[in-house]
């Protein structure tokens, strides 16, 4: 019979990118296991990750049902084996997570430049519309399909021969910018959701430079 009492989880943290959403917590279990429950403000508590010794739980399947809802999770601690529980009167120990609204809080993943084409003094840069784990009628939706006009991109570009940077913005997945004919350019893009108060911008895409081995058209 063990002597280590069950302890409540702490540091409950949401980790979410493009709606792939994982709840993490501490501590690593010693003589205990966890079960996670998730709920909307108006909904019922649904158990996930039953009797696990992990300190994370993938809740994507639940939050993608309605990404504009606000979710709350809680982590229950149960004694493993014949260990005493510290819960009073048979009440299980649990800790609540912060609230999480996927639409407002999921990180936007690093964008990818799908292709670029130069024609004279115009350069067209296309950003790949990444798929999310949100489904509609059995089909995965793209970022653009989920966010619509709330999603924009910022292009940062410069001449290969210069360090002076310029920026352009778009509410679509394409940029059409004026360039000097015959010059090569380097550029990267960043996703942005201007209406947000947190996680407004993604990390920058890898920098692409024209005239390198990849060629001027990349799919």
């Amino acid at each position: 019979s063990g002597t280590t009492n069950t302890v409540a989880a702490y540091n409950l943290t949401w980790k979410s990118t493009n709606f792939k959403t994982i709840l993490e917590w501490e501590p690593k279990p010693v003589n205990q296991v966890y079960t996670v429950q998730i709920s909307t403000k108006s909904g019922d508590w649904k158990s996930k990750c039953f009797y696990t010794t992990d300190t994370e739980c993938d809740l994507t399947d639940e939050i993608v049902k309605d990404v504009k809802q606000t979710y709350l999770a809680r982590v229950f601690s149960y004694p493993a084996g014949n260990v005493e529980s510290t819960g009073s009167a048979g009440e299980p120990l649990y800790e609540n997570s912060p609230e999480f609204t996927p639409y407002l809080e999921t990180n936007i993943g690093q964008p990818v430049i799908q292709k670029y084409e130069q024609g004279g003094t115009k350069l067209k840069v296309t950003v790949k519309d990444s798929f999310t784990l949100v489904r509609k009628n059995g089909t995965f939706l793209t970022l653009r399909q989920v966010f619509g006009n709330d999603l924009g991109y910022i292009l940062t570009y410069r001449k290969s021969s210069s360090s002076g940077k310029k920026t352009a913005k778009t509410n679509t997945n394409e940029f059409l910018i004026d360039v000097d004919k015959g010059e090569n350019y380097c550029f990267s893009v960043q996703a942005v959701i201007p209406s947000r108060t947190v996680n407004r911008k993604s990390t920058d895409s890898p920098v692409e430079c024209m005239g390198q081995e990849k060629g001027e058209f990349r799919e």
């Epitope: 079960t35 019922d44 508590w45 649904k46 158990s47 039953f50 084996g81």
Partner: antibody, heavy 121, light 107 residues
């Protein structure tokens, strides 16, 4: 095919212990939780606890805490349930039952045939 | 512990009848409910999981539904081989708990 085969009936005296075995075959032993459920004569079903064969972690219903021990032997794909300090109320059929896949994680989709344990002086 | 109140405790119906069993949870358990069939002297058999999903190989005359904390198990057309005791089981909260069972007999 997937099956769970349990050890035979036992007759025990009050205060003694009993150890029931459950041998799994036809699936990857480590990938599914195993539960123990008992049923007293003419009564309903009662969940006793769960063991994760992968790491051997167990969780018991509070009612059995301190009296039950669930173990597993991965080399023979067998789980064991030992109940100590037996009393007459422990007379029951003891079942092992496999927890389902991730789709139905805590639904018991495969059951052993049951082991009758009689506690009598 | 979550109490699962199953009713009726027994019923008698004719072959071809529609049979309904209910299970009420003492608190919200989402759709984390399973239904089992147990024939005399045999181990239980899983019929329905997650309130309404039919286990592979189970005849389509068996079905399950949920309304809040009330769960319904239905046999659309009772067959002689359906004579058994039926149990509900919740798994949303520890410990897992069963209903008291409903014994179904043929008139």
């Amino acid at each position: 095919q997937v099956q769970l085969v349990q050890s035979g009936a036992e007759v025990k005296k009050p205060g003694a212990s009993v150890k029931v075995s459950c041998k799994a075959s036809g699936y990857t032993f480590a990938n599914y939780y195993m539960h123990w459920v008992r049923q007293a004569p003419g009564q309903g079903l009662e969940w006793m606890g769960i063991i994760n064969p992968s790491g051997g972690i167990t969780v018991y219903a509070q009612k059995f805490q301190g009296r039950v021990t669930m173990t597993r032997d991965t080399s023979t794909s067998t789980v064991y349930m030992e109940l100590s300090s037996l009393r007459s109320e422990d007379t029951a059929v003891y079942y092992c039952a496999r927890g389902g896949s991730k789709v139905a994680a805590l639904a018991f989709d495969i059951w052993g045939q049951g082991t009758m344990v009689t506690v009598s002086s | 512990d979550i109490q699962m109140t199953q009713s009726p405790s027994s019923l008698s119906a004719s072959v071809g009848d529609r049979v309904t069993i209910t299970c009420q949870a003492s608190q919200d358990i989402s759709n984390s409910l399973n239904w089992y069939q147990q024939k005399p002297g045999k181990a239980p058999k899983l019929l329905i999981y997650d309130a309404s999903n039919l286990e592979t190989g189970v005849p389509s005359r068996f079905s399950g539904s949920r309304s809040g904390t009330d769960f319904t198990f239905t046999i659309s057309s009772l067959q002689p081989e359906d004579i058994a005791t039926y149990y509900c089981q919740q798994y949303n909260f520890h410990p897992l708990t069963f209903g008291g069972g409903t014994k179904v007999e043929i008139k």
